[in-house]
Interface confidence: low
C-alpha cells in the first residue's frame, strides 16, 4: 500500500494506491482511492507512467480528458466514472501489453488540494492449472496442465502423504510456446503417483503462484484450483 | 527554434524509386512521433504513414495505399526522418511534407514541402 | 476506419460574415484538430483538441463538438482567413491520423 501527500501551497489531499499486477490480453485495474470532493467538476484524476511522455490518462469537468494521452493508451483505458465522487480513481487498462509494466503515479487534484501516490504494476500471463489422471500413460500418472504464463515458471510437485518429498526425479515439465509467440503452456507430468492421496502441483513466477490439488482414491477423483497474485502492495 | 527541412524530391519515371529526407532541428528528435503527409495538385492532404518515438519502440504504420511501396526510416544519430519511395507510380505525383505529431495527437511543426513529380 | 467528411467544400463569403465549418468523423471520436493552409504554403495548425487555438491564431476562431460532430467557426470572417481547413483526428484501431477533405473559404 502506497499513501501519498500533496505538497506545495493548496492543502495536501491522500492519495492510496495498491501495486498490482495485469494478466496480458486481459483487462487490468490500476487502484488508486482519495478523498472525495462534493463536486465532480472539482476533481482532475491524471495517471501517467514513468519513461511516457503523454499521459495515461486524464478525467476532469467529470469526464475524459484524451488530448494528451500517449498513443500506446489509447483507446484502452477507462476511470469508473459514476465512483470519481466517492474517491474511486481506479483505472481500467483494456488489453494488457507486456509494455504496460511500470510505475505509475496517481495525480489528483480536488478544491482541498492536491495528492498523488505511486504504483508498480506488473504485467505477465497466469493462469489456473487442472490436474487430471492421465491415462493414457502406463503406470498411475497425474498430468497437469495451464494454458498462459509468462515469464517461465516454476513447477515443483508435492503430496500430502509424502511432506517434504522431492519429486523432480519422477516428474516432467514442458513449456510450450503459445501461438502469440510470448505466454507459454504449462505441461507438467508425475509418474508414481500412490493412490489415497492428494497431490498438488504449484506454478508460481514473480506475478503469481497457482496451485492444483488432485485427491485420488479408488473410488474417486477430486480437483481443487486456487491462483494468488503476488506482491499486492498498497502505497 | 524547431525546423523541419524535406529534401529529395524531383522529377522521376514511372516505376523509379526515390528517397526523400527531413532534417529536424530545435528538439529532442527521438521524443517525438514523425510522419509524412503529401497532397497531390489541388486535392486535400493524405496521410502515408508514422514512425513512433523511442518509448514507443520506433515503430511504424503505414496508410493502405503505399504499404509495400513506400518504406520510413529515422536516424536518431542525425536527426532525421526518411521515406524511401520504390515502384513509383504517376499519381505519386504531390508535395511530401514531414511532419511532428505534438503528443496531443495532432502535427505541430511542418517543414515547407517537397515536390514530387511521376512523369514519363 | 474512421472517416472525416467535411462541409462544405467551398465557400463564398463576404467580410464580417460568420462562417462554420462542419467535419463528421464515421464513429465516435474523442477529440478534432483542424489545419489551416494557404496556397503553396504548408498547412499550420489552427485548433487542436477540438477548442484550443494555435499559438497566434485569432480570438475570432473558435473550435466546438463531440462524439461524430465537430466544428470550426470563424466570427467575423477577415481577408487574411482565406485559406483551406482541414480537420484531422487520431484513431487507435487501427493506429492512424485521418484528414478530411479540406473545406475552401473563399473572400466575396
Known amino acids: 500500500l502506497i499513501i501519498g501527500f500533496g505538497i506545495s501551497g493548496r492543502h495536501s489531499i491522500t492519495v492510496t494506491t495498491v501495486a498490482s499486477a495485469g494478466n496480458i490480453g486481459e483487462d487490468g485495474i490500476l487502484s488508486c482511492t482519495f478523498e472525495p470532493d462534493i463536486k465532480l467538476s472539482d476533481i482532475v484524476i491524471q495517471w501517467l507512467k514513468e519513461g511516457v511522455l503523454g499521459l495515461v490518462h486524464e478525467f476532469k469537468e467529470g469526464k475524459d480528458e484524451l488530448s494528451e494521452q500517449d498513443e500506446m493508451f489509447r483507446g484502452r483505458t477507462a476511470v469508473f466514472a459514476d465512483q470519481v465522487i466517492v474517491g474511486n480513481a481506479s483505472l481500467r487498462l483494456k488489453n494488457v501489453q507486456l509494455t504496460d509494466a511500470g510505475t505509475y503515479k496517481c495525480y489528483i487534484i480536488t478544491s482541498k488540494g492536491k495528492g498523488n501516490a505511486n504504483l508498480e504494476y506488473k504485467t505477465g500471463a497466469f493462469s489456473m492449472p487442472e490436474v487430471n489422471v492421465d491415462y493414457n500413460a502406463s503406470s498411475e500418472t497425474l498430468r497437469c496442465e495451464a494454458p498462459r504464463w509468462f515469464p517461465q515458471p516454476t513447477v515443483v510437485w508435492a503430496s500430502q502423504v509424502d511432506q517434504g518429498a522431492n519429486f523432480s526425479e519422477v516428474s516432467n515439465t514442458s513449456f510450450e510456446l503459445n501461438s502469440e509467440n510470448v505466454t507459454m503452456k504449462v505441461v507438467s507430468v508425475l509418474y508414481n503417483v500412490t493412490i489415497n492421496n492428494t497431490y498438488s502441483c504449484m506454478i508460481e513466477n514473480d506475478i503469481a503462484k497457482a496451485t492444483g490439488d488432485i485427491k485420488v482414491t479408488e473410488s474417486e477423483i477430486k480437483r481443487r484450483s486456487h491462483l494468488q497474485l503476488l506482491n499486492s502492495k498498497a502505497s | 527554434e524547431v525546423q523541419l527541412v524535406e529534401s529529395g524530391g524531383g522529377l522521376v519515371q514511372p516505376g523509379g524509386s526515390l528517397r526523400l529526407s527531413c532534417a529536424t532541428s530545435g528538439f529532442t528528435f527521438s521524443d517525438y512521433y514523425m510522419s509524412w503527409v503529401r497532397q497531390a495538385p489541388g486535392k486535400g492532404l493524405e496521410l502515408l504513414g508514422f514512425?513512433?518515438?523511442?518509448?514507443?519502440?520506433?515503430?511504424?504504420e503505414y496508410s493502405a495505399s503505399v504499404k509495400g511501396r513506400f518504406t520510413m526510416s529515422r536516424d536518431n544519430s542525425k536527426n532525421s526522418l526518411y521515406l524511401q519511395m520504390n515502384s513509383l507510380k504517376t499519381e505519386d505525383t504531390a508535395v511530401y511534407y514531414c511532419?511532428?505529431?505534438?503528443?496531443?495527437?495532432?502535427?505541430?511543426?511542418w517543414g515547407q514541402g517537397t515536390t514530387v513529380t511521376v512523369s514519363s | 476506419e474512421i472517416v472525416l467528411t467535411q462541409s462544405p467544400d467551398f465557400q463564398s463569403v463576404t467580410p464580417k460574415e460568420k462562417v462554420t465549418i462542419t467535419c463528421r468523423a464515421s464513429?465516435?471520436?474523442?477529440?478534432m484538430h483542424w489545419y489551416q493552409q494557404k496556397p503553396d504554403q504548408s498547412p499550420k495548425p489552427w485548433i487542436y483538441a477540438t477548442s484550443n487555438l494555435a499559438s497566434g491564431v485569432p480570438s475570432r476562431f473558435s473550435g466546438s463538438g463531440s462524439g461524430t460532430d465537430y466544428t470550426l467557426t470563424i466570427n467575423s470572417l477577415e481577408a487574411e482567413d482565406a485559406a483551406t481547413y482541414y480537420c484531422?483526428?487520431?484513431?487507435?484501431?487501427?493506429?492512424?491520423?485521418?484528414f478530411g477533405g479540406g473545406t475552401k473559404v473563399e473572400i466575396k
Open positions: 511532419a511532428r505529431d505534438s503528443h496531443r495527437t495532432y502535427f505541430d511543426y
Open positions: 514512425i513512433r518515438n523511442k518509448a514507443n519502440g520506433y515503430t511504424r
Open positions: 464513429s465516435s471520436v474523442s477529440s
Open positions: 484531422q483526428q487520431w484513431s487507435s484501431n487501427p493506429p492512424m491520423y485521418t
